[in-house]
């Protein structure tokens, strides 16, 4: 798979969409998940319902919301309230049983947003130690979607 | 391919008011971010509004210079977006570009209008 | 806000020659938190509206010749456009998006 980057401000929304084909995926539940390292785990954020037919009611885990338009075949993720902490490698992922496939890999990019001063005139510029590793998975992600789906096995 | 178009430029007295539109095509404009950038001579090239998408709430920025005399709205229904320009002043004159900071996946100002030219003058 | 100063204003050059554009700004605008600095390149012809040539200070858009390449870190900006050909005549202005948005004032080419 490819990695399709895509670039968020801080302090923003982020939406992140994943397509796929949706007979293929054909009652398959949609997960988003954090990738750790280059060929670590990846740890799942948010899942679609557990009830297939509900996958259209957007779930939150945090600030990362998940919703799938299985008839158009299309994943969105919704990160709100984009932070440096966030960026980093995901994936959206279809699952099936204990498996889990990869719709699209996406890279998140978190940015400076050139317009929000906070009112006080000065950017926060994050110190050189904190790293995007340190970031938690339960973060939220602000953006606008994407199109990408997220599968990832289903929670026990 | 991605196009904007200006429309609504003009000759007007200074104190006068002058509404310009701008229509979008070529990309998803409910997820862009839609700005006005001008130019003129004396100035060169200056940002002068924007206006966000609706997951970030339509919100609304300004250059200091024209803070509480323009207002920047869009309509998503429309792929279009308008910049209501009130009080304004013979520095307010120059070619008004229609561009966008953000398309929802990328930040750069990646494609411009071809502009429209706005005169203040008595 | 970040003031972006371009030198020289403007510039006579034959066809072929290597040309280098300066732009300096005020306060860098390298984002330590993304590795980024957040300048653009802009070619702008007679009757035509701005061309992003070049963003993120070296990351040339699709399409853009190779001829053109930005380089630079922090503070201190360059456009280099090796062997200038009739259709690069133009003005160039370099931007910073990381402070607000402001504009350099522009390095005119010109045909010698």
């Known amino acids: 798979h490819n990695t399709t980057v895509f670039q968020g401000v801080a302090g923003q929304s982020l939406q992140v969409s994943c397509p796929y084909d949706s007979m293929k995926h054909w009652g398959r539940r949609k997960a988003w998940c954090r990738q750790l390292g280059e060929k670590g785990p990846c740890q799942r954020v948010v899942s679609t319902h557990n009830l297939w037919l509900l996958s259209f009611l957007r779930r939150w885990n945090g600030s990362t919301a998940i919703t799938d338009d299985t008839l158009g075949g299309t994943l969105t993720i919704t990160l709100r309230n984009l932070q440096p902490h966030d960026a980093g490698l995901y994936q959206c992922q279809s699952l099936h049983g204990s498996e889990a496939d990869t719709l699209r890999k996406v890279l998140v990019e978190v940015l400076a947003d050139p317009l929000d001063h906070r009112d006080a005139g000065d950017l926060w510029f994050p110190g050189e130690s904190e790293s995007f590793e340190d970031a938690h998975v339960e973060h939220s992600i602000s953006r606008s979607l994407l199109e990408g789906e997220i599968p990832f096995p289903p929670t026990s | 391919e991605v196009k904007f178009e200006e429309s609504g430029g003009g000759l007007v007295q200074p104190g006068g008011s002058m509404k310009l539109s701008c229509t979008a095509s070529?990309?998803?404009?409910?997820?862009?971010?839609m700005d006005w950038v001008r130019q003129s001579p004396e100035k060169g090239l200056e940002w002068v509004a924007e206006?966000?998408?609706?997951?970030?709430?339509?919100?609304?920025y300004y250059a200091e210079s024209v803070k509480g005399r323009f207002t920047i709205s869009r309509d998503d229904s429309k792929s279009s977006v308008s910049l209501q320009m009130n009080s304004l002043r013979t520095e307010d004159t120059g070619i008004y570009y229609c561009?966008?900071?953000?398309?929802?996946?990328?930040?750069?100002?990646?494609?411009w209008g071809q502009g429209t030219l706005v005169t203040v003058s008595a | 806000n970040i003031m972006l100063t371009q030198s020289p204003s403007s510039l006579a050059v034959s066809a072929g020659e290597k040309v280098t554009l300066s732009c300096k700004s005020s306060?860098?605008?390298?984002?330590?938190?993304?590795?980024?600095?957040?300048l653009a390149w802009y070619q702008q012809k007679p009757g035509q509206s701005p061309k992003l040539l070049i963003s993120?200070?070296?990351t040339r858009e699709s399409g853009v010749p190779d001829r053109f390449t930005g380089s630079g870190s922090g503070t201190d900006f360059t456009l280099t456009i090796n062997s200038v050909q009739a259709e690069d005549l133009a003005v160039y202005y370099c931007?910073?998006?990381?402070?607000?948005?402001?504009f350099g004032a522009g390095t005119k080419l010109e045909l010698k």
């Open positions: 561009t966008s900071l953000y398309d929802g996946s990328y930040l750069r100002f990646a494609y």
């Open positions: 070529g990309f998803t404009f409910s997820d862009a971010w």
């Open positions: 206006i966000r998408n609706k997951i970030n709430n339509h919100a609304t």
């Open positions: 306060q860098s605008v390298f984002y330590s938190s993304n590795q980024k600095n957040y």
């Open positions: 993120w200070a070296s």
């Open positions: 931007h910073q998006y990381l402070s607000s948005l402001t």
